[in-house]
Interface confidence: low
């Protein structure tokens, strides 16, 4: 069963995934996709690395860790309810059926609505994580947020920005439903 991770609307979500390169710079291709890991590849790819670099990405999906050292944990910025669901981290080890597959369940909760402060503030927080040789760490250490920061300024400003219907539509429609051709 999938390990569950949580984040609130407007925050950044962090989905951990790690492997140990055989040698420094000897990277294994990795793909992240929305939906459970299929037999091969990733479905609905949102980010992909090759032996050297990130070669496919979209604007809200980032590798904030050092992927050259095997930290291929995914950060999804400014999440919406539509980002909820299963994500696949697939470490594409050469050889027939050698891939390591990890299904991670992301649960997005509505933001806690509080009266807008008289003076807008920025909040950042860091959460501990447990590095593992392969796969992901215990869920309780990875409950929400990105490393190194979470930006919560949207909570007090999102209501104003949502008056722009284009923003509202894009927050709903973009990001999690992108794939490579």
């Amino acid at each position: 069963s999938e390990v569950e991770y949580r984040a609130e609307v407007g925050q950044n979500a962090y989905l951990p995934c790690f492997y140990t390169p055989a040698a420094p710079g000897n990277l294994v291709p990795v793909c992240w996709g929305k939906g459970a890991c299929p037999v091969f590849e990733c479905g609905n790819v949102v980010l992909r690395t090759d032996e050297r670099d990130v070669n496919y990405w979209t604007s809200r999906y980032w590798l904030n860790g050092d992927f050259r050292k095997g930290d291929v944990s995914l950060t999804i910025e400014n999440v919406t309810l539509a980002d909820s669901g299963i994500y696949c981290c697939r470490i594409q080890i050469p050889g027939i059926m050698n891939d390591e597959k990890f299904n991670l369940k992301l649960v997005i909760k509505p933001a806690k609505v509080t009266p807008a402060p008289t003076r807008q503030r920025d909040f950042t927080a860091a959460f501990p994580r447990m590095l593992t040789t392969r796969g992901h760490g215990p869920a309780e250490t990875q409950t929400l947020g990105s490393l190194p920061d979470i930006n919560l300024t949207q909570i007090s400003t999102l209501a104003n920005e949502l008056r722009d219907s284009r923003l509202a539509n894009d927050l709903r429609d973009s990001g999690a439903t992108i794939r490579i051709g």
Partner: antibody, heavy 118, light 113 residues
Framework: QVQLVESGGGLVRPGGSLRLSCAVS????????MSWVRQAPGKGLEWVSG????????YNADSVKGRFTISRDNSKNTLYLQMNSLRAEDTAVYYC???????????WGQGTLVTVSS | EIVMTQSPDSLAVSLGERATINCKSS????????????LAWYQQKSGQPPKLLIY???TRESGVPDRFSGSGSGTDFTLTISSLQAEDVAVYYC?????????FGQGTKVEIK
């Protein structure tokens, strides 16, 4: 209203360096990924570099990899492009642009001209 | 990367007449799960930065006159100016945002005949 104002362009010799800045106002800067897009004289648009809202991740076009570095200071609402080892083919107007949604550009600055010539 | 090709490179149209610009992508930019085409159109007037006109292939940006419309799906797209006005003289670019890096067409110059 949204404003993006670039600065730092100018004439530089091949192999030289420049640092472009883009001062931003009118939206929550840290909530949006940003980009640099350039346009050589009389030519079309070319995406150069992008950075996530937090600044934690950056991506560059192959043509500038290893030479250009994009960064941002969210406390100053400013986007930067450090350009090293400049070549004649880097001559262009450089625009900073706000990335919206999946990766289109809903606001652009007026641009700053970079000329690389001996 | 996805290559975007526009046609024609330039066109001259009489005031009040229809102008049509085509854009072709080297691979589909339609994502079937949400039935959206990851394509935008920009207008760039002389000496000015580009301006977003249309995104998701057919959604007009706020404030853009309704004489501008976008259509098409998959790999073939069209920007139509239903009744050309003097202020529409510009270069128009398509851009895909389906797969990184984002890429633009080479541009189509629209002039008054």
């Amino acid at each position: 209203q949204v404003q993006l104002v670039e600065s730092g362009g100018g004439l530089v010799r091949p192999g030289g360096s420049l640092r472009l800045s883009c001062a931003v106002s009118g939206f929550t800067f840290s909530s949006y990924a940003m980009s640099w897009v350039r346009q050589a004289p009389g030519k079309g648009l070319e995406w150069v570099s992008g950075i996530s809202g937090s600044g934690g991740s950056t991506y560059n076009a192959d043509s500038v990899k290893g030479r250009f570095t994009i960064s941002r200071d969210n406390s100053k609402n400013t986007l930067y492009l450090q350009m090293n080892s400049l070549r004649a083919e880097d001559t262009a107007v450089y625009y900073c642009a706000k990335i919206f949604g999946s990766y289109y550009f809903d606001y652009w600055g007026q641009g700053t001209l970079v000329t690389v010539s001996s | 990367e996805i290559v975007m090709t526009q046609s024609p490179d330039s066109l001259a149209v009489s005031l009040g007449e229809r102008a049509t610009i085509n854009c072709k992508s080297s691979q589909s930019v339609l994502y079937s799960s949400n039935n959206k085409n990851y394509l935008a159109w920009y207008q760039q007037k002389s000496g000015q930065p580009p301006k977003l006109l249309i995104y998701w292939a057919s959604t007009r940006e706020s404030g853009v006159p309704d004489r501008f419309s976008g259509s098409g799906s998959g790999t073939d797209f069209t920007l139509t100016i239903s009744s050309l006005q003097a202020e529409d003289v510009a270069v128009y670019y398509c851009q895909q945002y389906y797969s990184g890096p984002p890429t633009f067409g080479q541009g189509t110059k629209v002039e008054i005949k």
